[in-house]
């Protein structure tokens, strides 16, 4: 059955300088491949976080993603700035065979509104 990616919140509001959590769960970890967060869509979308071991300043995973059955890929963004405003997508990839990973499913997106403090 096809993997489903769920982002329960259509939008969240956060005051500048505060933290916010963007929720994402998947229904299956198969086929194997990473899960990544992006802001925006299309060619100009920006990689925000990847669950592949790299360090991303101000962003961390919420659950213990080292659990082999973990299906929660929510992230916490700290010290939010106005530049963080936009729509965030949680995306499941299938690992490529000697080629780039293939996007197979995206969540519906969560729009982040940044309020002046």
């Amino acid at each position: 059955t096809e993997v489903k990616v769920t982002q329960p919140e259509k939008s969240v509001s956060v005051a500048a300088g505060d933290s916010t959590i963007l929720n994402c769960t998947v229904t299956s970890l198969l086929p194997v491949g990473p899960i990544r967060w992006y802001r925006g869509v299309g060619q100009s979308r920006l990689l925000i976080y990847s669950f592949t071991g790299e360090h991303f300043p101000r962003i961390r995973n919420v659950s213990d993603t080292t659990k082999r059955n973990n299906m929660d890929f929510s992230i916490r963004i700290s010290n939010v700035t106005p530049e963080d405003a936009g729509t965030y997508y949680c995306v499941k990839f299938q690992r490529g065979s000697s080629e780039p990973d293939t996007e197979i499913q995206s969540g519906g997106g969560t729009e982040v509104y940044v309020l002046a403090k």
Epitope: P31, V32, T52, D64, T65, T66, K67, R95, S98
Partner: antibody, heavy 118, light 108 residues
């Protein structure tokens, strides 16, 4: 520099118990899943246990399930393997290994020898 | 018995290219890695996530995958590459880490 140093190996009689330790340094231990892998004399590698970063979830192959218990103390940067009801076929060098994000292994300790013999 | 299958031995002359294959895992549920082990030493990770090479591993070691078969390629083989090479995997469907039986690389 990532370092993994195993200890606790030795000679034990069949049916006996032993606890192995692995002291980790050079990385944020509490952020990484860890595993134990063994190698019987002249044989290949065999994975025997894995544990999540927080320590709540553990994983075993059928060959050791119910006899071996993996655990960790993140405050001491130490990984453990409790081995009970040991058999002659458990004789091996036991390595601790750090897991990558997708549960492969990137760093290995030097190993500690466990000999089960009467 | 080992869940992953690799040839017991491979021989190659210095400067030539050695290829070691590994099969047996489902492409949709497996990740693969390659480990080198010299006599009396601990394993060293050469390749992980099918084709990623740690920064301390020479570029002559590379990994590739095609369907259910993965391949370790050693270009310009050197005498010091003589060792046992193990294919290892992570099976997301069973949460286990199977290994192949190992391949002894002999440099002629």
């Amino acid at each position: 520099e990532v370092q993994l140093v195993e200890s606790g190996g030795g000679v034990v009689q069949p049916g006996g118990s032993l606890r192995l330790s692995c002291a980790a340094s050079g990385f944020t231990f509490s952020s990484n899943a860890m595993s134990w892998v063994r190698q019987a004399p002249g044989k290949g590698l065999e994975w025997v246990a894995g544990i999540s970063a927080g320590g709540s979830d553990t994983y075993y192959p059928a060959s050791v399930k119910g006899r071996f218990t993996i655990s960790r103390d993140n405050s001491k940067n130490t990984l453990y393997l409790q081995m009970n009801s040991l058999r002659a076929e458990d004789t091996a060098v036991y390595y601790c290994a750090r897991e990558t994000w997708n549960h492969l292994f990137d760093y290995w300790g030097q190993g500690t020898l466990v000999t089960v013999s009467s | 018995s080992y869940e992953l299958t690799q040839p017991p031995s491979v021989s190659v002359s210095p400067g030539q290219t050695a290829r070691i294959t590994c099969s047996g895992g489902s492409y949709s549920s497996y990740y693969y890695a390659w480990y080198q082990q010299k006599p009396g030493q601990a394993p060293v990770t050469l390749i992980y996530s099918d084709d990623k090479r740690p920064s301390n591993i020479p570029e002559r070691f590379s990994g590739s995958s095609s369907g259910t078969t993965v391949t370790l390629t050693i270009s310009g083989v050197q005498a010091e590459d003589e060792a046992d090479y193990y294919c290892g995997g992570y099976d997301q469907s069973s949460y286990t880490n199977p290994f192949g039986g190992g391949t002894k690389l002999t440099v002629l």
